[in-house]
Interface confidence: low
């Protein structure tokens, strides 16, 4: 009988970390230094991402996966895929066009990034201020005066502050 010829693309046999080299009769060649292919059957390897300047390498490039960058100390990532590094500020500050500025009275920032947020308004929940707010910390709300009868619980812990900025959906 006549053997049927395989119609499969010979390049499909090239695993991740290699590329199908058209210059060498479609032989699977290893990716050159500083390049990678994360899937099989590729005709080229991609250049590794370089973590330069304010970026530092979080994960080295390998023949099968790209490098991942984060930011040097004093900076933090912004944007999808850490597309830039933004300067850190101190707690109690926020970054403005003119650099780090202290939070205005009535606002706080308990992190090195993000914006100053208003203190919690305890009275909206019918509670009183147990601990005053600062530039670095939110107020702590306590029970309302009416709740301070004998046997009543003394302190209601504050809800944890949400981190500002975008979080993945």
């Amino acid at each position: 009988f006549e053997r049927t010829r395989s119609l499969q693309d010979p390049c499909s046999n090239c695993p991740a970390g290699t590329f199908c080299d058209n210059n060498r009769n479609q032989i699977c060649s290893p990716c050159p230094p500083n390049s990678f292919s994360s899937a099989g059957g590729q005709r080229t390897c991609d250049i590794c991402r370089q973590c330069k300047g304010v970026f530092r390498t979080r994960k080295e490039c390998s023949s099968t996966s790209n490098a991942e960058c984060d930011c040097t100390p004093g900076f933090h990532c912004l944007g999808a895929g850490c597309s830039m590094c933004e300067q850190d500020c101190k707690q109690g500050q926020e970054l403005t066009k003119k650099g780090c500025k202290d939070c205005c009275f009535g606002t706080f920032n308990d992190q090195k990034r993000g914006i100053c947020r208003p203190w919690t308004n305890c009275s909206l929940d019918g509670k009183s201020v147990l601990v005053n707010g600062t530039k670095e910390r939110d107020v702590v709300c306590g029970p309302s005066p009416a709740d301070l009868s004998p046997g009543a619980s003394s302190v209601t812990p504050p809800a944890p502050a949400r981190e500002p900025g975008h979080s993945p959906q």
């Epitope: 990678f36 292919s37 994360s38 899937a39 590729q42 080229t44 390897c45 991609d46 991402r49 370089q50 330069k52 300047g53 304010v54 970026f55 790209n66 960058c69 912004l78 944007g79 999808a80 895929g81 597309s83 830039m84 590094c85 066009k97 975008h166 993945p168 959906q169």
Partner: antibody, heavy 125, light 108 residues
């Protein structure tokens, strides 16, 4: 040739669903972050959704959050947008776009460097 | 979110003219600014990235400048194929990616 080809658009009633697909060729799809961008008739460009190259990080525009779902299948070199609870204001041409990275000495920049031809979604009763 | 505002919304010009389109960001975006060209019925095409770097294959009559909040796209000598809509886009703080509203360049 580096190429993105969208499909799956069509006419759908308000409240209905569609799934858009985008097939990549000519580049290592699994190495790139991808986005969906739409354009309502006679209007400008509006970003819809982002997915990282591994699919672990996802973002949505506020106007579609909770109704649209982005996903990808790197083995099939495909990007998807599942659209539920469609509204008249979702009527647009939907483009998939590759997020290319350009390295600078301090920062690195990204831009939408490859776009598909677009697929039209019409939401009407 | 960072807002991008382009001006003018539309303009008429003749072949050979020098044309400038401006884009303003609602806050400083350093040089994280891209420009796209879109012709009717077609997908957008990247022209300039990082405010002033020309994308491969784009004619040298296109140039970009600016940093911070104010940016310009300049076409030094308009050609017939340049009549299109142009969009700026910031990539400084994402998500969301935000675009300007577009500038339509028409033949006078």
């Amino acid at each position: 040739e580096v190429q993105l080809v969208e499909s799956g658009g069509g006419l759908v009633q308000p409240g209905g669903s569609l799934r858009l697909s985008c097939v990549a060729s000519g580049f290592t799809f699994s190495s790139y972050e991808m986005n969906w961008v739409r354009q309502a008739p006679g209007k400008g460009l509006e970003w819809v959704s982002y997915i990282s190259n591994s699919g672990t990080t996802i973002y949505y525009a506020g106007s579609v959050k909770g109704r649209f779902t982005i996903s990808r299948d790197n083995a099939k070199k495909s990007l998807y947008l599942h659209m539920n609870s469609l509204r008249a204001e979702d009527t647009a041409v939907y483009y998939c776009a590759r997020e290319g990275t350009i390295f600078g000495t301090v920062h690195y920049y990204f831009a939408l460097d490859v776009w598909g031809q677009g697929t039209t979604v019409t939401v009407s009763s | 979110d960072i807002q991008m505002t382009q001006s003018p919304s539309s303009l008429s010009a003749s072949v050979g003219d020098r044309v400038t389109i401006t884009c303003r960001a609602s806050q400083s975006i350093s040089s994280y600014l891209n420009w796209y060209q879109q012709k009717p019925g077609k997908a957008p095409k990247l022209l300039i990235y990082a405010a002033s770097s020309l994308q491969s294959g784009v004619p040298s009559r296109f140039s970009g400048s600016g940093s911070g909040t104010d940016f310009t796209l300049t076409i030094s000598s308009l050609q017939p194929e340049d009549f299109a809509t142009y969009y700026c886009q910031q990539s400084y703080s994402t998500p969301p990616i935000t675009f300007g509203q577009g500038t339509r360049l028409e033949i006078k």
